[in-house]
Amino acid sequence: QSFQVNPPESEVAVAMGTSLQITCSMSCDEGVARVHWRGLDTSLGSVQTLPGSSILSVRGMLSDTGTPVCVGSCGSRSFQHSVKILVYAFPDQLVVSPEFLVPGQDQVVSCTAHNIWPADPNSLSFALLLGEQRLEGAQALEPEQEEEIQEAEGTPLFRMTQRWRLPSLGTPAPPALHCQVTMQLPKLVLTHRKEIPVLQSQTSPKPPNTTSAEPYILTSSSTAEAVSTGLNITTLPSAPPYPKLSPRTLSSEGPCRPKIHQDLEAGWELLCEASCGPGVTVRWTLAPGDLATYHKREAGAQAWLSVLPPGPMVEGWFQCRQDPGGEVTNLYVPGQVTPNSSS
C-alpha cells in the first residue's frame, strides 16, 4: 500500500482569500482504499471524496485555520497524516509617521502594519533600516496592537504599530530610512518595506546644546530575519530614487575597519582596503542593483569595484566587509559628485 498527501508538508500557510487543495490518496492491493478527512470544520463542498482519494479545499478564510487529519485505511491497515493549516493576512499596507524626518531633532518614528493576521509578536517583527542595515542606536518603544474596524463580521484583522526613538542622524543626514515588517510563518517569510524620507535641508535644526550629535552608525550584522534552508523569501521593497547627497561613509563600531577610496582615474573605481595587521581580507558585499554586474578584483586586504562597461558609478550605497571580525564600511555615492575617501 502507498499513502500520499500532496502537498506533503505538515504545516501549510495560506494567504487569506486564496484557495489551496490538499489531496490525500491511498492505493490498496486488496480492493479500494477508504480515505477521508476529519478534524476540520469542513462545510459542504470543501471535501471531495473519490475512490482511493480525498481532496480538501481550503478557501483562505480564517475559519479554515486548524489541523485536519487525513485517514486512509486498506483492509486492517490504516494510516493518517495531519496538516496544520494557518491562514494569514499580510497585505502591503504599511503606514509610517511622520511623512519625513527632520535631521537634528529628537523624534519618534512609527510604523503601522494594517490588516494583519495572526497578530502574534512572535510571527511579526519590525525593523528600522538604513540601507540594508538595522539603524543602530534606535530605541524601540512599546508595540501596540489594535483590532481593525471591519465592514464584515467574523474577520478579526489587526493593526500592529512599532515606534522608535531615533538617534542623531548625523551630518549630512542619510537620504531615507525604511520601516521593514517581516511575517514569519511555517516555511514562509514575507517582508514589506516603506520608505521614510529624510528632509534634506541646508538649515536643519540643531540638536539641543546639552547634547553632542554624533554620526549615525550601522550595525555590521545582516538584517535578514530567521532565514534558513527551505524557507521562501518574498521581499517587497519600495525604492524611489534618493535625493542628491555628498558622499557619506558609515562604519560598524570597532577599533579597526576597512576604508573605501574613490578613484576617478579608472572610471569611478572604488578601492576598499584594510590595514589591521596580517591575515585580514576585504570583499564587497553591497552595491546598488546586482553586485554581480560589477567588476570586482579582490587581493587580500584590498578589493576593487568598478562599473562594467567603464562609466560613472551608480548612485547608492556601497558596502565593504572585512574578515575576520565582520566589520563593514558603507559609502553613499551620489549621482555626480567630486570623489573623496572614507574616514
Epitope: G137, L141, R163, P167, P207, P208, T211
Partner: antibody, heavy 119, light 107 residues
C-alpha cells in the same frame, strides 16, 4: 549644575494616593524625556514610567499600569507621578531620572523620595 | 521583556584587585547597555553608557565591553570608594530593564 530633586513621599495606607514631584534645574527641561524608577527596600532598580519632552508619549511598567500617571509641567520644570490605589508592594524609594537625547540612557538621577504603603 | 542577568550576585575583593562583573541579556541589545554604581542610601550614578563609553567624570579604572547579549564591567584596580552595588541596564527597547545587581564588598 544639573539637578533633580524629588519630593512628596511619605506614609500612606493601602488604597490611598500620593503625588510625587521632581524639580529640575540646570538644563532645558523640555528637551528631555524623563523617567521614574523605584527601588524596594533591599531590592534592585525597577523602571516604572517615562514621559517625552512634549508629553506626547507616556508609558508604564505593567506593575503600575492603570494606577500611576506620569505628567510634567515644562513651564515649572517639574515632573510628576500621581500614584493611586497604592499597595504594600509599591513601598520603595522613587527616583526621577533624565534621559539623554539620541542615546537614551539615564544620565542624571535625583536623590530619591521614600514612599511607604502600610496600614 | 528583555531579562538582564548579572553575575556574580556579590563578591569580596581587596583594594587594588581587578574586579570583573558580567551581565547577560536574554536577547540582543546591541550596544544599548549602561552600568550604574549605587552606594547605600544614595541614588544610582552612571558609569558606562553604550556598553563601553566612560561617562564624564568617572575614573578611567572603570571600563565596559561587550555587545549583543554579553557584557562586562571591569574595575582595573579597586579603590576604597568603589565598594558599592553595580547594576547593568538595557535601554534598547521598552520596558527598559536592570540586572539584579552585584554587591562588591571588602574582603
Amino acid at each position: 549644575e544639573v539637578q533633580l530633586l524629588e519630593s512628596g513621599g511619605g506614609l500612606v495606607q493601602p488604597g490611598g494616593s500620593l503625588r510625587l514631584s521632581c524639580a529640575a534645574s540646570g538644563f532645558t527641561f523640555s528637551d528631555f524625556w524623563m523617567h521614574w524608577v523605584r527601588q524596594a527596600p533591599g531590592k534592585g532598580l525597577e523602571w516604572i514610567s517615562y514621559i517625552s519632552g512634549d508629553s506626547g508619549y507616556t508609558y508604564y511598567a505593567d506593575s503600575v499600569k492603570g494606577r500611576f500617571t506620569i505628567s510634567r509641567d515644562n513651564s515649572k520644570n517639574t515632573l510628576y507621578l500621581q500614584m493611586n490605589s497604592l499597595r504594600a508592594e509599591d513601598t520603595a524609594v522613587y527616583y526621577c531620572a533624565r534621559d539623554r537625547p539620541y542615546y537614551y540612557y539615564m544620565d542624571v538621577w535625583g536623590k530619591g523620595t521614600t514612599v511607604t504603603v502600610s496600614s | 521583556d528583555i531579562q538582564m542577568t548579572q553575575s556574580p550576585s556579590s563578591l569580596s575583593a581587596s583594594v587594588g584587585d581587578r574586579v570583573t562583573i558580567t551581565c547577560r541579556a536574554s536577547q540582543s541589545v546591541s550596544r544599548s547597555l549602561a552600568w550604574y554604581q549605587q552606594k547605600p542610601g544614595k541614588a544610582p550614578k552612571l558609569l558606562i553608557y553604550a556598553a563601553s563609553s566612560l561617562q564624564s567624570g568617572v575614573p578611567s579604572r572603570f571600563s565596559g565591553s561587550g555587545s549583543g547579549t554579553d557584557f562586562t564591567l571591569t574595575i582595573s584596580s579597586l579603590q576604597p570608594e568603589d565598594f558599592a552595588t553595580y547594576y547593568c541596564q538595557q535601554y534598547k527597547s521598552y520596558p527598559v530593564t536592570f540586572g539584579q545587581g552585584t554587591k562588591v564588598e571588602i574582603k
